[in-house]
């Protein structure tokens, strides 16, 4: 499968949407930074066939989207912005899974690796409970923002090395 | 390879104008901030103030506040250290700084190889 | 600001020797607080970050350790390249902050 050109380019502009996000100066929560433990490994392409990493992949985004779609989430940013980060999450998952069908009887591993997929949620939690812990207070956004801007980043490495797979 | 290459040495009288520079390459420019550090002759390293390239919001050491302005243009990748009025004791070596912003990453972990700046009559 | 506090400001010490040096925040900066080593005339490289993380090809005979006000540098056993000035740093809040620095000479 070929991940169109067209989910590159979401992957840029949902970097870009993200850049735009920020409602304070984040060098008011310095002291905010948190260690939620990225799963480089995951990200590292290396150990696992082409199925299981879009499935990683789509694991991400499917969390970004649904870490984005609370009510805290909505009441912190800006609504004009959240529909455009909205649709270009959906148009990469739509991509992500049309790849996904494509590799059904392609390769003989399976098409999830299900430990990789565990350590993504558990990610995910780690800013959920951490976000939790402080109130869902501006400062905690803006330091989740620029963690999933780091994730973002590091996917779309990932992304780069599938394509140059084919 | 991650590197910040710094605009040559300068040396200037008193009362002139002077933008240094610091050319960042083999990362992506905008997902770190850039940080100033001055260091007087034979004295320990001081702040000056930082800026995120992304959108050019800055801060300042309030020592340093008013006396310098720092800029960035993402688009080659360059920040900026300025003065509009120099002074003799402005005299230093000035350092250039990647930091990872509020990432869970090593702060200032690669530095621009320095500009000195000497202000003399 | 938070003031950091470097002792000693000087050392002398020999090959081999096991050197430590100590810095003091004036407040509590939890574990952010970074190591830098200078040699004369080169800018300062990074050693030790969030108090006891290692920086990337440094090696394993530095480490730090501490938390909340009170923090140190260990150099295990002192080589040739490891005469230097030292800086604690602060980065909790701005202004970010340095120590005055720790030289390490030659006994």
């Known amino acids: 499968c070929d991940l169109p050109q067209t989910h590159s380019l979401s992957n840029r502009r949902t970097l870009m949407i993200m850049a735009q996000m920020g409602r304070i100066s984040p060098f008011s929560c310095l002291k905010d930074r948190h260690d939620f433990g990225f799963p480089q490994e995951e990200f590292d392409g290396n150990q696992f066939q082409k199925a299981q990493a879009i499935s990683v992949l789509h694991e991400m985004i499917q969390q970004t989207f649904n870490l984005f779609s609370t009510k805290d989430s909505s009441a912190t940013w800006d609504e004009t912005l959240l529909d455009k980060f909205y649709t270009e999450l959906y148009q990469q998952l739509n991509d992500l899974e049309a790849c996904m069908m494509q590799e059904v009887g392609v390769e003989d591993t399976p098409l999830m690796n299900v430990d990789s997929i565990l350590t993504v949620r558990k990610y995910f939690q780690r800013i959920t409970l951490y976000l939790t812990e402080k109130k869902y207070s501006p400062c905690a956004w803006e330091v989740v923002r620029a963690e999933i801007m780091r994730s973002f980043s590091l996917s779309a490495n990932l992304q780069e090395r599938l394509r140059r797979k084919e | 390879e991650v590197q910040l290459v710094q605009s040559g040495a300068e040396v200037k009288k008193p009362g002139e104008s002077l933008k240094i520079s610091c050319k960042g390459s083999?990362?992506?420019?905008?997902?770190?901030?850039i940080g100033w550090v001055r260091q007087m002759p034979g004295k320990g390293l001081e702040w000056m103030g930082i800026i995120d390239p992304s959108d050019s919001d800055t801060a300042y050491s309030p020592s340093f506040q008013g006396q310098v302005t720092i800029s960035a243009d993402k688009s080659i990748s360059t920040a900026y250290l300025q003065w509009s009025s120099l002074k003799a004791s402005d005299t230093a070596m000035y350092y250039c700084?990647?930091?990872?912003?509020?990432?869970?990453?090593?702060?200032?972990?690669?530095w621009g190889q320095g500009t000195l700046v000497t202000v003399s009559s | 600001d938070i003031q950091m506090t470097q002792s000693p400001s000087s050392l002398s010490a020999s090959v081999g020797d096991r050197v430590t040096i100590t810095c003091r925040a004036s407040q509590s900066i939890t574990n952010f607080l970074n190591w830098y080593q200078q040699k004369p005339g080169k800018a300062p490289k990074l050693l030790i970050y969030f108090a006891s993380s290692l920086q990337s090809g440094v090696p394993s005979r530095f480490s730090g350790s501490g938390s909340g006000t009170d923090f140190t540098l260990t150099i295990s056993s002192l080589q040739p390249e490891d005469f230097a000035t030292y800086y604690c740093?602060?980065?909790?809040?701005?202004?970010?902050?340095f120590g005055q620095g720790t030289k390490v000479e030659i006994k």
């Open positions: 740093q602060q980065s909790l809040d701005f202004p970010l902050t």
């Open positions: 700084a990647r930091h990872p912003g509020l990432n869970w990453a090593p702060d200032f972990d690669y």
């Open positions: 083999g990362y992506s420019f905008t997902s770190y901030w």
